[in-house]
């Protein structure tokens, strides 16, 4: 799998989409996990509804939400109030028994907000109590890592 880069602005919402073959993954729940190191496990962040029929319902874990269009074949993850610590490598997964197939490898990059919210005066910033439905979702910038680019740069 190539890694797709999604860039979002700190404090705003980032939407990550993972297309998949809806026939092949028929009846299978999906999940969003965070990769812990290059060869480490992928730690589950949030998964779709326990009943596959209800996968279209948005499920949330903290500031992350997931919803699945099972007929269209698109899994959508929304990271709300994006923070620097959200940057990193993730996977969209399809769950099959005790196994998990990788649908897409994702690198989330968090860009500094060009507006300094502390000096923004009356600028409205979504509060923690705001629902995902009300959150403003920015169009994400995404690209695939070029051949030869290192997803996990060696640490010094």
């Amino acid at each position: 799998h190539n890694t797709t880069v999604f860039q979002g602005v700190e404090g705003q919402s980032l939407q990550v989409s993972c297309p998949y073959d809806s026939m092949k993954h028929w009846g299978r729940r999906k999940a969003w996990c965070r990769q812990l190191g290059e060869k480490g496990p992928c730690q589950r962040v949030v998964s779709t509804h326990n009943l596959w029929l209800l996968s279209f319902l948005r499920r949330r874990n903290g500031s992350t939400a997931i919803t699945d269009d099972t007929l269209g074949g698109t899994l959508t993850i929304t990271l709300r109030n994006l923070q620097p610590h959200d940057a990193g490598f993730y996977q969209c997964q399809s769950l099959h028994g005790s196994e998990a197939d990788t649908l897409r490898k994702v690198l989330v990059e968090v860009l500094a907000d060009p507006l300094d919210h502390r000096d923004a005066g009356d600028l409205w910033v979504p509060g923690e109590s705001e629902s995902f439905e009300d959150a403003h979702v920015e169009h994400s910038i995404s690209r695939s890592l070029l051949e030869g680019e290192i997803p996990f740069p060696p640490t010094s």
């Epitope: 073959d21 026939m23 092949k24 028929w26 009943l51 596959w52 029929l53 007929l71 099959h96």
Partner: antibody
Framework: QVQLQESGPGLVKPSGTLSLTCAVS?????????WSWVRQPPGKGLEWIGE???????NYNPSLKSRVTISVDKSKNQFSLKLSSVTAADTAVYYC????????????WGQGTTVTVSS | DIQMTQSPSSLSASVGDRVTITCQAS??????LNWYQQKPGKAPKLLIY???NLATGVPSRFSGSGSGTDFTFTISSLQPEDIATYYC????????FGGGTKVEIK
């Protein structure tokens, strides 16, 4: 249009392995569909055995999972069923079928082949 | 496993009669249900998919309805060639079939 044809031994000994092949013609096994096996014991209803996708991903009936293996051979445009440790209860007509799920159901079936488990 | 309960198990009707078969799922399956016709010694034939869609080449006297757990299959005017066993089948999870309904002519 797509046609399916089952083939394999009609008689298998108890505790042996039942092996059947389904040849796909008039289309490609790489088409967007699941390729299924369904069986029907004499005078009884239909039982789904399992299915395979062209990339060799499989789903099996939980009650048969420990004994079933379904494989695909894209070069020959066919898929196969192996059922191990058979008993008389596995005597049935075995059908292969194409399953397009929401997009059209099990819309193409083979004519079926009778397999008898007996010594 | 999702259980499919079909009723009646058999019925006898006259040519031209309206015939109705019901199928009940043990849990919500939305409209993910198919109906098949099987004549003696033949493979099953798809009649209705997604609860209410008529498969290609199937006469319009066959119809299906329902959603959730309760489904109905109807032959609006029974014909001699409709003598067969009819099965419902869900495909939300591992596919399961109803027990079948044998339709005979009076």
């Amino acid at each position: 249009q797509v046609q399916l044809q089952e083939s394999g031994p009609g008689l298998v000994k108890p505790s042996g392995t039942l092996s059947l092949t389904c040849a796909v013609s008039g289309g490609s096994i790489s088409d967007s569909a699941w390729w299924s096996w369904v069986r029907q014991p004499p005078g009884k209803g239909l039982e789904w055995i399992g299915e395979i996708y062209h990339d060799a991903d499989t789903n099996y009936n939980p009650s048969l999972k420990s004994r079933v293996t379904i494989s695909v051979d894209k070069s020959k445009n066919q898929f196969s069923l192996k059922l191990s440790s058979v008993t008389a209860a596995d005597t049935a007509v075995y059908y292969c079928a194409r399953d397009t799920k929401y997009w059209g159901g099990m819309d193409v079936w083979g004519q079926g082949t009778t397999v008898t488990v007996s010594s | 496993d999702i259980q499919m309960t079909q009723s009646p198990s058999s019925l006898s009707a006259s040519v031209g009669d309206r015939v109705t078969i019901t199928c009940q799922a043990s849990q919500d399956i939305s409209n993910y249900l198919n109906w098949y016709q099987q004549k003696p010694g033949k493979a099953p034939k798809l009649l209705i998919y997604d609860a209410s869609n008529l498969a290609t080449g199937v006469p319009s006297r066959f119809s299906g309805s329902g959603s959730g757990t309760d489904f109905t299959f109807t032959i609006s005017s029974l014909q001699p060639e409709d003598i067969a066993t009819y099965y419902c089948q869900q495909y939300v999870e591992a596919p399961t079939f109803g027990g079948g309904t044998k339709v005979e002519i009076k």
